[in-house]
Structure formats: structure tokens, C-alpha cells
């Protein structure tokens, strides 16, 4: 995984760190999975499981891998070219307006409403008024009459942090 190369032509403080694989930048940029050295002469590989870069870049630091929070499951691990993919656990979801935490899905709809959408990792159950068919949004008052729902299947990531 590592390639030791000598760089006698470089200023002494810019020589290669032996534990990291290096290549040369192309037009001042380094490929995904790398960052640029501070003298601009080398592309240094990110550390698997610790940091990453997704695009051609001139980053001085690779980006830190996201750690999934409790209440989240890791769909795919962090690689040198892709951040960790985290998803809310079954029965919970993450809203766009509160992306920092997974919230519990409602167990059913209020009286006079019917469920038309299941709980998914990225959305709560969806309720509509029986007659009008208009969606219900916002906090639910005390549920008097509920229609039970099974948690949605975690099919795809609800957030790609990073």
C-alpha cells in the first residue's frame, strides 16, 4: 500500500512521508483519493477509513470520514474516494430541515386521515385527509384513532455527509 520514493531534489522539509503513496499532480490537481503536498510536487494518498477526496483537487488535507451516529446504520464504509454512507435505523427518519438527527416515525395517522406513505429512512409516514386528499404536515396532536404502519425498508441513504 505504500511506496517509498526518494526526493533529493526537494527542499529537505518537503520530502516524502514514507508511509503514504505518492504520484505527480496533473495541471496542479491530484486525483480522487489524494491530496496535494504543500510544495505542489506530489499527490499524497488519503488514509483508508480515515479520510478521503472525491474529485480532482488541490486540497492540503483529505476530508475527514464521517462517523455514523448512534441511531444510524453504516450502509457503506469510508474509502479513500468516498465518504461513509449513513442511514437512519428502521423506524426513524431524517428530515431535510433537521439533518443532524434521526427522528422516530409516527406510528399512525390522526383521525380523519389515511396513510399513503410508509416510514422510510428519509421520510415520516405520509397522511392525507380522507375526503380532500390533502397532505398533513407538521406535528401531530394526540392520536385518537391510528392506522398502524410497518416501518419502511431501508432502501437508500438519506444523507451523504461530507
Amino acid at each position: 500500500e505504500s511506496a517509498l520514493i526518494t526526493q533529493q531534489d526537494l527542499a529537505p522539509q518537503q520530502r516524502a512521508a514514507p508511509q503514504q503513496k505518492r504520484s505527480s499532480p496533473s495541471e496542479g490537481l491530484c486525483p480522487p483519493g489524494h491530496h496535494i503536498s504543500e510544495d505542489g510536487r506530489d499527490c499524497i494518498s488519503c488514509k483508508y477509513g480515515q479520510d478521503y477526496s472525491t474529485h480532482w483537487n488541490d486540497l492540503l488535507f483529505c476530508l475527514r470520514c464521517t462517523r455514523c451516529d448512534s441511531g444510524e446504520v453504516e450502509l457503506s464504509p469510508c474509502t479513500t474516494t468516498r465518504n461513509t454512507v449513513c442511514q437512519c435505523e428502521e423506524g426513524t427518519f431524517r428530515e431535510e430541515d433537521s439533518p443532524e438527527m434521526c427522528r422516530k416515525c409516527r406510528t399512525g395517522c390522526p383521525r380523519g386521515m389515511v396513510k399513503v406513505g410508509d416510514c422510510t429512512p428519509w421520510s415520516d409516514i405520509e397522511c392525507v385527509h380522507k375526503e380532500s386528499g390533502t397532505k398533513h404536515s407538521g406535528e401531530v396532536p394526540a392520536v385518537e384513532e391510528t392506522v398502524t404502519s410497518s416501518p419502511g425498508t431501508p432502501a437508500s441513504p438519506c444523507s451523504l455527509s461530507g
Epitope: Q14, A17, Q19, G28, E38, G40, D58, L60, F61
Partner: antibody, heavy 117, light 108 residues
């Protein structure tokens, strides 16, 4: 011989702005990442900001994020630090330094920024 | 962020004596990104050691650096009058870059 020469420091009121410059010579400026490091009177060194050789990537200490902007003009071999919304705690000698992560191998003589009413 | 703690805060020694300065990191840092600087009053810092143990250009061999992981040491084998100054360690492993608070080496 590598030389870094800062300018632009001075006395400014809280909330005011100042732009520091660092003229570089003696090395291929556009290839190297550059930094600003500051030192409050009688205190230790604090890294402030860094920029990649092309200027495409910039980094800031939390204490200055959103208020300071680092930039460079490679055609003029000059590094800049635009400082806005200045506070009393920003009072320090500001050094321009060559390098970022491995080391700061060359430093300017520093320019004093005093934030006071 | 990685916090670097230097000890002792002040070291009182006589010329000719050996000085041992410590720099401890709050989490592991790469040796490739650990440097030491010397600063005298009214002057800019000067790079002494980079990569934990490599001497910068023009630095006398009485200065040496060692260590890995979280514990690093700067040793001045035999203090010269011009070595009395403040010494800082610095890490560049993770953003933000951080310095230790400094160790002052003063004449006893």
C-alpha cells in the same frame, strides 16, 4: 534567498477591517502553500489560515472563520489576509509563513495589528 | 483539534548543560507532520526540526528531535548562549494546525 515581507498592519477600531499583504521572493511562489500565523503580545503562536499553491483550497482557524479571507496573486508573488469584523482579541503580530503541514520553513518579520477603540 | 502540551513551561539551565523539552499530543500525530521552532524576543520563529527528527538547513547538530505517536522530544545536547529562547512544537497531521504553548529555556 527566500524572503517574505509583510505589510498592512496598524491600529484599527473594533468592527473595522484591514488587509495584510506578504510579498514573496526567492522561490517559486505559485507552487507552494502559504500560511498566516499570529502571536498576541506575550503569548504563543496561533495558526490563522492557509492556502494551496493555486489558491483553490483555503483553511481557517475557528477563531477567524467567516471574518478573515486568505487569498493570493501568483502573478504578483503576493499573499493576502483580508480581516473584517476585527475584535480586540485579534491584536497580534501577524506572520506570513511558507508551508503549512510539514513545517513553516520561512517566516516574514511580522506586522503588528492593534484592535482598540 | 489536536492539543499539544509542552513541558516544562520554563527550563532554567546553564550554558553547556543538556536541555530536554517535551511535546505531548492529545491524540496520535504523524511524525512526518511534527516540527519544532525557536523564537527569540522581537524575532520571527525559526524552523529547527521537521518530520519529528530531521534538522532544517543550517541548524547545528546539537539540536535533535525524536519521538512518535503522542510523545515527542527536542534535545539540545550542550546549550550555547544563543540557545536561550522559547521553543514551540507544531503538528500538521489534522486541520486545524496547532502549536504547543511553548517552553522557555532561560539562563540559570
Amino acid at each position: 534567498e527566500v524572503q517574505l515581507l509583510e505589510s498592512g498592519g496598524g491600529l484599527v477600531q473594533p468592527g473595522g477591517s484591514l488587509r495584510l499583504s506578504c510579498a514573496a521572493s526567492g522561490f517559486t511562489f505559485s507552487s507552494y502553500a502559504m500560511s498566516w500565523v499570529r502571536q498576541a503580545p506575550g503569548k504563543g503562536l496561533e495558526w490563522v489560515s492557509a492556502i494551496s499553491g493555486s489558491g483553490g483550497s483555503t483553511y481557517y482557524a475557528d477563531s477567524v472563520k467567516g471574518r478573515f479571507t486568505i487569498s493570493r496573486d501568483n502573478s504578483k508573488n503576493t499573499l493576502y489576509l483580508q480581516m473584517n469584523s476585527l475584535r480586540a482579541e485579534d491584536t497580534a503580530v501577524y506572520y506570513c509563513a511558507k508551508g503549512v503541514r510539514v513545517s513553516f520553513d520561512y517566516w516574514g518579520q511580522g506586522t503588528l495589528v492593534t484592535v482598540s477603540s | 483539534e489536536i492539543v499539544l502540551t509542552q513541558s516544562p513551561g520554563t527550563l532554567s539551565l546553564s550554558p553547556g548543560e543538556r536541555a530536554t523539552l517535551s511535546c505531548r499530543a492529545s491524540q496520535s500525530v504523524s511524525s512526518s507532520y511534527l516540527a519544532w521552532y525557536q523564537q527569540k524576543p522581537g524575532q520571527a520563529p525559526r524552523l529547527l526540526i521537521y518530520g519529528a527528527s530531521s534538522r532544517a538547513t543550517g541548524i547545528p547538530d546539537r539540536f535533535s528531535g525524536s519521538g512518535s505517536g503522542t510523545d515527542f522530544t527536542l534535545t539540545i545536547s550542550r546549550l550555547e548562549p544563543e540557545d536561550f529562547a522559547v521553543y514551540y512544537c507544531q503538528q500538521g497531521t489534522t486541520h486545524p494546525i496547532t502549536f504547543g504553548q511553548g517552553t522557555k529555556v532561560e539562563i540559570k
